[in-house]
């Protein structure tokens, strides 16, 4: 239904009352200069708010930091600035929260000129108590957490330095000079890239990538003339420069970098770039930017293995190297991603997959907008979703697109109706089946989150004037209430709610200004009274991913299975609560040649699933053939979709090809791997 | 053209069970949910529960908690009803019927076939 | 669980007449909402589903109308083969039924 039609709308009653009970004011007694908050735990109601203040003297910046603690959702804060000894924080490095609920904190000082090394503060309490500690370097990036054990942690020092700890920041060790770039792999391995000669800009294409398994105590090279290097899911990645030319390609790993594959993609110039997507255990996106400065490239979807590679969609938007695009992967919904493309006259259009990259079409118009001025035909025209590059533009798009996992199916988003992203005013739109239908949620730019798991969303106009009202929904943004949550408007500067949607507060950020001062000011609103009861199986009713038509056979098949959900009734007003956990089915479908890809050599002409031999190699298939390893050149032309888990049907099984024959020259062996110790 | 086909008349005594089945025909039985509806001698009609092919996935009226199971065997694209503790009140026209569907969702659209019925009659 | 109250629970009619059967929900269903009808000795058939929408086949002169808690079926002109038995039926909750409508040869 349209927004605001009243007919439809359950109103919950007495909400004033309601909220007025829990709405928490929070005035924070400094200078207005720059706030950063974050969430310390998960359920733990910790928040750790950071103010700083810059005056830029002549000679120096003198600054002023100061720290609030709160443990309860953000509803009171205490200043905890003494426990930093009334330090200057560098909000560059913000507060390096610990992985999960291991309640550690690092906070990286501003330390005088002619310190020896830097400053860090540490907690391993849920911020409750600090220890000073004076680093022997300077760090150059944030403290980076072992995902495996938090108490290992790495950093680079301003001198290239690779740095690391044990003991949670307790004592660094030098593990390596001359490093570019550093993260943790799995199992507390850490990759690095080095450099021999001059610096890492300098050496860019002739690093060489480390990998230690003992934190610094043995080393192994893995790789050399290296351009730069990801992680992804379960696959290491290194783009590697040519022997012949300034050229580089994209080498693979699935076992830490012991063995590496040359994955079959496109060689890209100097001025291009690969960009890893998104990946999961299963697969990876790679974007790969065209010659020349278009600002356009094509996505590849790999096979399990990272090595072979399906064209998924041509004319990618993703601005020159490390730019923007809006490549969003739709997490309430699996197989779900969302992109732009830039059409032949240079409009951009929105562009969705399902079925995690087979397949893109426009998004349906929804029901209740009208084609704008973009549109050639006032009846037939798409949805377009504002994301990064819109905002990178400065559009007067406050949010990107919104999913959240336990909100299965909802993704809220800005956008335009028409054939391509408009520069006019965007409206927010909603849908609630993982991206297949939109209804116009809110008019206008807004920002806005899910609280409890789905059960609540909450939204704020954009305004550039002060705010004083918050809008909320109780059936997925169908029907909106407003609620003043203060007399005096604040100019509005951010919304936040604790991060996995669980949560049933939201914390309205602003400032005040009057004549003379200016102040931060926070009101924390709790939603607990307005969702009364706990939600009961009655609340819930059964819904089909994927459905497009219950008369097909395989209604809701995406990667070989479907999955029905419980969900929340629209009309329930009740609490899916803090320990709510998404309820599925799965069901197993039949295999069809939907759920195979070509291997190599292979391809699917136009409209047609039959993966098909290629009639001779040549480009980057001819390359790969040539330096690609071998038992990959063996195969009967078609593997599984990674993640597919499809069974009987069509088993496309014929004879076993060796490609070897296609290629032209005789295989390289592929560079013999050192090790070392320290 | 798709049919729900119903076991036949059942007479019981009070105390025991029925088990009451209803065969699909002519499509596609996994992707819709089967509810069952119940119908004493001049009365109203009574929904009793539902089941989802995907995983067996019932749920039942307050009512019939306990008292009722709803099962589902894709493979013969047949649903079956089983009431227990059978009592006099229990004796009425059974119906299974497709729950109709145009999205996901599987109870929202109204139940657009029905199967002949199932007389039970429950008697000492 | 949701109640639904059909009225009248009787309705004499002639040939041609418009007529018109209310539903009331105890709470909102937004437009959850099903139309049947029964005649003695057969199964029940349905005639509008999602309050407003005409099942395939159903003759044009049924219509449904409403939303939230108010909902009415409408026979425009009342043929013969339409003396029967008529149902709401909610689907927003568990599914609860209307206690019936007859419309009987005045």
């Known amino acids: 239904s349209a927004p605001g039609e009243d007919e439809e709308c359950g109103r919950v009653r007495d909400f004033v009352a309601k909220l007025a009970n829990n709405t928490h004011q929070h005035v924070f007694d400094d200078l207005r200069g720059s706030v950063s908050l974050s969430w310390v735990g998960d359920s733990t109601g910790v928040i750790l708010v950071l103010t700083t203040f810059h005056v830029p003297l002549v000679i120096m910046t003198f600054g002023q930091s100061k720290l609030y603690r709160s443990e309860d959702y953000g509803k009171n804060f205490k200043d905890i600035t003494d426990l930093i000894n009334n330090t200057f924080i560098r909000t560059e490095f913000g507060m390096a929260i610990g992985p999960e609920n291991s309640g550690k904190v690092v906070l990286t000082a501003e330390v005088s000129g002619g310190s020896r090394g830097g400053r860090i503060f540490r907690s391993s309490d849920f911020a409750k108590n600090f220890v000073q500690t004076d680093l022997p370097f300077h760090p150059l990036t944030q403290m980076m957490y072992s995902p495996q054990n938090s108490d290992y942690l790495l950093a680079l020092s301003t001198e290239n330095g690779l740095w690391v700890s044990k003991n949670f920041g307790g004592k660094w060790e030098e593990i390596h000079k001359a490093v570019c770039l550093a993260k943790w792999g799995s199992d507390n391995t850490i990759f690095f890239t080095t450099y021999a000669n001059g610096s890492c800009k300098a050496d860019l294409g002739a690093l060489e990538l480390w990998r230690t398994s003992d934190l610094g105590k043995s080393f192994k090279t893995i790789g050399v003339k290296i351009y730069s290097f990801g992680l992804g899911g379960r696959f290491l990645f290194a783009s590697v420069m040519a022997d012949k030319d300034t050229t580089r390609r994209i080498h693979v790993s699935t076992d830490q970098g012991d063995t590496w594959s040359m994955a079959q993609l496109p060689s890209v110039g100097q001025e291009q770039f690969y960009s890893i997507l998104a990946a999961n255990d299963d697969m990876v996106f790679m974007h790969v930017d065209e010659p020349g400065d278009t600002g356009f490239g094509t996505i590849f979807t790999s096979d399990d293995r990272g090595i072979v590679y399906s064209k998924s969609l041509d004319r990618h938007l993703y601005t020159t190297t490390g730019g923007e695009t809006d490549f969003t992967n739709v997490t309430s919904l699996r197989g779900v991603y969302i992109t732009s493309v830039l059409s032949e006259d240079n409009s951009i259009q929105t562009m969705i997959t399902f079925d995690q990259g087979g397949r893109w079409t426009h998004l349906r118009k929804p029901e209740n907008s009208e084609c704008d001025a973009t549109a050639k035909n006032k009846n037939e025209c798409s949805l377009h979703i504002h994301a990064s590059y819109s905002i990178s533009q400065k559009l007067n798009v406050p949010m990107a697109p919104l999913s959240e996992p336990n909100a299965v199916g909802i993704v809220i988003a800005h956008g335009s109706v028409g054939d391509a992203i408009s520069v006019m005013v965007p409206d927010v739109y909603i849908s609630d089946d993982g991206g297949y239908s939109w209804t116009k949620m809110l008019e206008g730019p807004h920002y806005y989150t899910i609280l409890d798991s789905g059960g609540i969303i909450v939204a704020i106009e954009h305004s550039s004037r002060p705010i004083n009202v918050i809008k909320f929904s109780t059936d997925e943004g169908q029907c909106w209430q407003t609620y003043t949550f203060t007399r005096d408007p604040i100019y509005f500067t951010g919304l936040a709610s604790e991060p996995g949607a669980r949560s049933m507060n939201i914390s309205i950020w602003g400032f005040t200004e009057s004549f003379l001062t200016s102040q931060w000011v926070s009101y924390t609103i709790d939603f607990k009274d307005i969702l009364e009861r706990n939600c009961e199986e009655k609340d819930y009713t059964i819904w089909l991913a994927h459905s497009t038509d219950p008369e097909d056979y395989e209604d809701g098949c995406i990667l070989g299975y479907k999955e029905a959900f419980l969900r929340l009734r629209k009309s329930s007003v009740c609490q899916n609560g803090r320990d709510y956990v998404v309820t599925k089915q799965p069901s197993i479908c039949l295999c069809s040649l939907e759920d195979f890809l070509c291997d190599f050599g292979y391809y699917r002409p136009e409209n047609d699933s039959k993966c098909v031999e290629q009639p001779e190699l040549k480009g980057h298939d001819l390359e790969f053939c040539l330096y690609g390893r071998e038992e990959h050149l063996t195969t009967n032309g078609y593997r599984k979709i990674p993640g597919d888990k499809c069974q009987g049907g069509v088993n496309p099984v014929r004879e076993v090809k060796d490609l070897k024959k296609k290629c032209t020259s005789n295989f390289l062996s592929p560079e013999k791997q050192n090790s070392k110790s320290n | 053209q798709v049919q729900l086909v119903q076991s036949g008349a059942e007479v019981k005594k009070p105390g025991s069970s029925v088990k009451v089945s209803c065969k699909a025909s002519g499509g596609t039985f996994r992707n819709y949910a089967i509810s069952w509806v119940r119908q004493a001698p001049g009365q109203g009609l009574e929904w009793m529960g539902g089941i989802i092919p995907i995983g067996g996935w019932a749920n039942y009226a307050q009512k019939f908690q306990g008292r009722v199971t709803i099962t589902a065997d894709e493979s013969t694209s047949t649903a079956y009803m089983e009431l227990s503790s059978l009592r006099s009140e229990d004796t009425a026209v059974y119906y299974c019927a497709r729950q109709g569907r145009k999205t996901g969702y599987y109870y929202y659209y109204g139940m657009d076939v029905w199967g002949q019925g199932t007389t039970v009659t429950v008697s000492s | 669980d949701i109640q639904m109250t059909q009225s009248p629970s009787t309705l004499s009619a002639s040939v041609g007449d418009r007529v018109t059967i209310t539903c009331r929900a105890s709470q909102s269903i937004s437009s959850w909402l099903a139309w049947y009808q029964q005649k003695p000795g057969k199964a029940p058939k349905l005639l509008i589903y999602?309050?407003?929408s005409l099942e395939s086949g159903v003759p044009s002169r049924f219509s449904g109308s409403g939303s939230g808690t108010e909902f009415t079926l409408t026979i425009s002109s009342l043929q013969p083969d339409d003396f029967a038995t008529y149902y709401c039926q909610q689907a927003d909750g568990h599914i609860t039924f209307g206690g019936g409508t007859k419309v009987e040869i005045k």
């Open positions: 999602k309050a407003s």
